[in-house]
């Protein structure tokens, strides 16, 4: 049973100040912690109430984290990432891709490199146009009688 | 719907050996950091030892040498063996479990974690 999630993909720059107990967040993955297929990218797995993450409110559970203070965090080891958000310092720079979910299919949750996800424009442009055709042939219809 | 169950506490003479077991169920350990804690009467609890999600083992110092940490995901269960144990080890220990690792503290912090178990009593004696 082949299911399909399509996903609407952001990207935003989220500077967090850390907070007494932190940045107040957990984090997957990496090259020896694969945590979506065919992706060793580093994604939010927890954020924690109260933490500085949780209070400024636009980190999500399930983001990936892409940078944090402008490096990249592309085929690194999970604890060289983890040491890397610890040693980042008071101000932390986040470069962050939302992932919304906008269709479900019966299996749960996939990988970037997975080919068989559409994006999301692919199918509303041409529903939009479809419609817009069908509206133009009903009016000239009308018209008609 | 996430639990821990502890088991395998006990009465032990002081310098006997003991394994207590944290066994998992509703989420997948692979990807979780799993800590052991413990409270002895009129304390506060304290980490013990933890094992984070690619499988580092971290020990607090009146515990290195005597303790093991050790995660079996196939079988989603976490054990503690505890060698030349003493009348202080006496106490409740409990397992805790947090998805992924934190990026603030190493696992042995016991507020990075969400879920916990219901204990198991060690008794040095």
């Known amino acids: 049973m082949n299911g399909r999630v399509d996903y609407l993909v952001t990207e935003e720059e989220i500077n967090l100040t850390r907070g007494p107990s932190g940045l107040g967040f957990n984090i997957v993955g990496g090259t020896d912690q694969q945590y979506v297929s065919n992706d060793s990218g580093i994604y939010v797995s927890r954020i924690k109430e109260n933490g500085a993450a949780a209070l400024d409110g636009r980190l999500q559970e399930g983001d990936k984290i892409l940078s944090v203070n402008g490096q990249d965090l592309k085929n690194l080891l999970h604890q060289d990432a983890v040491d890397l958000f610890r040693n980042a310092g008071y101000a932390v720079s986040l470069r962050v891709q939302h992932r919304l979910q906008v269709q479900n299919g019966p299996i749960g949750h996939r990988g970037e490199g997975d080919p068989s996800g559409i994006p999301i424009f692919m199918v509303l442009v041409p529903v939009f146009a479809l419609t817009m055709v069908a509206a133009w042939a009903f009016m000239r219809y009308r018209q008609q009688l | 719907d996430v639990q821990l169950v502890e088991s395998g506490g006990g009465l032990v003479q002081p310098g006997g050996s003991v394994r207590v077991s944290c066994v998992s169920s509703g989420f997948i350990l692979d990807y979780y950091a799993i800590g052991w804690f413990r409270q002895a009467p009129g304390k506060e609890r304290e980490g013990v030892s933890c094992?984070?999600?690619?499988?580092?083992?971290y020990y607090v110092d009146s515990v290195k040498g005597r303790f093991i940490i050790s995660r079996d995901n196939a079988k989603n269960t976490v054990y503690l063996q505890m060698n030349s144990l003493k009348p202080e080890d006496t106490a409740v220990y409990y397992c805790?479990?947090?998805?992924?690792?934190?990026?603030?503290?190493?696992?042995?912090?016991?507020?990075?974690?969400?879920?916990w178990g219901q204990g198991t009593q060690v008794t040095v004696s």
């Open positions: 094992i984070d999600s690619v499988g580092r083992a």
């Open positions: 805790a479990a947090d998805f992924g690792s934190s990026v603030d503290s190493t696992c042995l912090n016991n507020q990075q974690y969400d879920y």
